[in-house]
């Protein structure tokens, strides 16, 4: 056959899907690799064509479309499994073409078993709510398309493996849950089980998502750099290791880019010709703020390098901050024998 | 009224076993609280021995802890302490606390249970 | 794991006075650091959380400043209904939750 823009195996697109449930999938090369649609297409006699690899196979195979009760079938740029089995895992290639052009793309389709409280192997997606923020809500997620707007579906949320009714500050509200204040206590996996009818069978859609509370932005606050501070000096003699870390705390911001460094004389480390090693370490708190610190270190200090500026510089979305860190040079102690003696006009 | 109430506590010989219940009422666990032991050995301070997240049912352990102490939800509105092999320094008042990974909203604390061990 | 190093051990002063406790943690914590005030026979009371925040009832002759790894608790006008032990917590996450050694506040 004639060449074919052939875009890969698009693992980009990893594909999850739960076992016995209903999946509609879209032709992901109108959606990331063509700079038309399918309509667009359609109407220029081009024709979607699907085939499929199945898991652990070399093979690549035309997809049954004459299964009892179409339970595979192809809608425009859509597959659609009503419902999905777990021998449909494999690799799905969708090819668009006609006498003088093709394109194809291969995404990977996983179909996934869930327990009875909703454990599963699927990635989950993660909802940030700002702790003790006033009402917050989150939808239920990927449903659009599934059934008309005619038909009215009955929604079940669940914390975990608890239906949620009667929760002091969570509310379920449809497809939207609402949480009246979101505290710690709200983090956790919650699920929305979407039940609707079609052509006389039931089917339902799992829909599970982590909430994860954070800080607020009523308690964010510019970088904090708790050392270097006025309390420590560091004073060393030539040829002992010089170690000064910069520890700083940032409030949570969402899509924040917290940043850290050291300068020496207005210098980056990487501009200077001492030898520095900058080690860096963070952790998070659980609203996700955030401690960075780093340890600035020279092995082996010289005298020069005691009467150089340490600085250390923070900054995220709330602004800028820098501190010097104290550095002096260790006055050597008096030998008795010698100094002391001179003083007593000895010779 | 949300209130905890500690249970179990008593004489036990060294080496024994005893499992320490907390009770809550006025809320449940299906909400994800962090559940805590906290104990207090007599004129002594608190010290924190395991938590437990009541909704994932993840858990936390002092090192120290490890082994000796387990953390478990038993029903939508109690959390127990197995305790092992306990000698005389197990000694104290044994708390029940909720939230104190997040004081700031919701803390709650039971008014305890003695465990003695001694022969 | 994390140390709650609190001073001094014990404190006594006059009604009325002023009496500063200080909680220094190994580690930073941010701000992440609540008071427990603890009378004999009962559990601790939460007094102060986020290092400055008033729990809801406490008075404001308490009062908590800090951050990082240096916190104090200052209470003025003393009162002899003050008289109890104070505990300092860290729970910036699972590897720094931990008590303080405890502050206990005698009226002279």
């Known amino acids: 056959s004639e060449r074919c823009d052939d875009w890969g195996l698009d693992t980009m697109r990893q594909i999850q899907v739960f076992e016995d449930e209903p999946a509609r999938i879209k032709c992901p090369l109108f959606e990331h690799f063509l700079k038309f649609n399918y309509s667009t297409a359609h109407s220029a006699g081009l024709t979607l064509i699907w085939y499929w690899t199945r898991q652990d196979r070399d093979l690549e195979e035309p997809i049954n479309f004459r299964l009892p009760e179409n339970r595979i079938s192809k809608e425009k740029d859509v597959l659609w499994f009503r419902p999905t089995l777990l021998n449909d895992t494999g690799n799905y290639t969708c090819m668009l073409r006609n006498t003088t052009y093709c394109s194809k793309v291969a995404f990977p389709l996983e179909v996934v078993q869930k327990d009875s409280c909703f454990n599963s192997p699927m990635k989950l997606p993660v909802h940030k709510l700002y702790i003790e923020y006033g009402i917050q809500r989150i939808t239920c997620p990927n449903v659009d398309g599934y059934f008309p707007s005619s038909v009215k579906p009955t929604i079940t949320w669940y914390m975990g493996c608890y239906k949620i009714q009667n929760f002091n500050n969570v509310i379920p509200e449809g497809m939207n849950l609402s949480f009246l204040i979101a505290l710690i206590s709200n983090n956790g996996n919650y699920t929305c089980v979407v039940t609707y009818p079609e052509n006389g069978r039931t089917f339902h859609l799992t829909r599970t998502l982590t909430v994860k509370v954070v800080g607020s932005p009523k308690n964010a606050v510019p970088p904090v750099i708790h050392s270097p501070n006025d309390h420590v000096v560091y004073e060393k003699e030539p040829g002992e290791e010089l170690l000064i870390p910069c520890t700083v705390y940032f409030s949570f911001l969402m899509d924040s880019r917290n940043e850290v460094w050291w300068t020496i004389d207005g210098k980056k480390p990487d501009d200077i010709t001492i030898d520095v090693t900058i080690n860096e370490s963070i952790s998070h708190s659980r609203t996700e703020d955030e401690t960075r610190t780093q340890i600035l270190s020279i092995k082996k200090v010289t005298s020069e390098d005691l009467k150089r500026s340490y600085v250390c510089h923070a900054r995220s979305a709330k602004g800028e901050v820098a501190k010097a860190a104290k550095v002096k040079q260790k006055v050597p102690a008096p030998r008795y024998t010698v100094e002391l003696a001179c003083g007593f006009g000895a010779t | 009224q949300e209130q905890l109430v500690e249970s179990g506590g008593g004489l036990v010989q060294p080496e024994g076993s005893l499992t320490l219940t907390c009770k809550a009422s006025?809320?449940?666990?299906?909400?994800?609280?962090?559940m805590c032991w906290v104990r207090q050995a007599p004129g002594k301070g608190l010290e924190l021995i395991a938590c437990?997240?009541?909704?994932?049912?993840?858990t936390w352990s002092a090192s120290w802890a490890k082994g000796r102490f387990t953390i478990s939800k038993t029903s939508s509105t109690t959390v127990t302490l197995q305790m092992t092999s306990l000698t005389a320094a197990d000694t104290a008042t044994y708390f029940c606390?909720?939230?104190?990974?997040?004081?700031?909203?919701?803390?709650?604390w039971g008014q305890g249970t003695l465990v003695t061990v001694s022969s | 794991d994390i140390v709650m190093t609190q001073t001094p051990a014990s404190v006594e002063a006059a009604v009325g006075g002023t009496v500063t406790i200080k909680c220094q943690a190994s580690?930073?914590?941010?701000?992440?650091l609540a008071w427990y005030q603890q009378k004999p026979g009962q559990p601790p009371k939460l007094l102060i959380s986020?290092?400055?925040t008033l729990a809801s009832g406490v008075p404001s002759r308490f009062k908590g400043s800090g951050s990082g790894t240096q916190f104090t608790l200052t209470i003025s006008d003393l009162e002899s209904a003050d008289v109890a032990t104070y505990y300092c917590?860290?729970?910036?996450?699972?590897?720094?939750?931990?008590f303080g050694g405890g502050t206990e506040v005698v009226v002279k």
């Open positions: 606390a909720r939230d104190l990974n997040y004081p700031d909203t919701s803390n709650l």
């Open positions: 006025g809320f449940d666990f299906s909400s994800n609280y962090y």
């Open positions: 437990i997240y009541t909704n994932s049912g993840n």
């Open positions: 580690q930073s914590i941010g701000y992440y």
């Open positions: 986020r290092a400055s």
């Open positions: 917590q860290s729970y910036y996450n699972s590897d720094s939750d931990a």
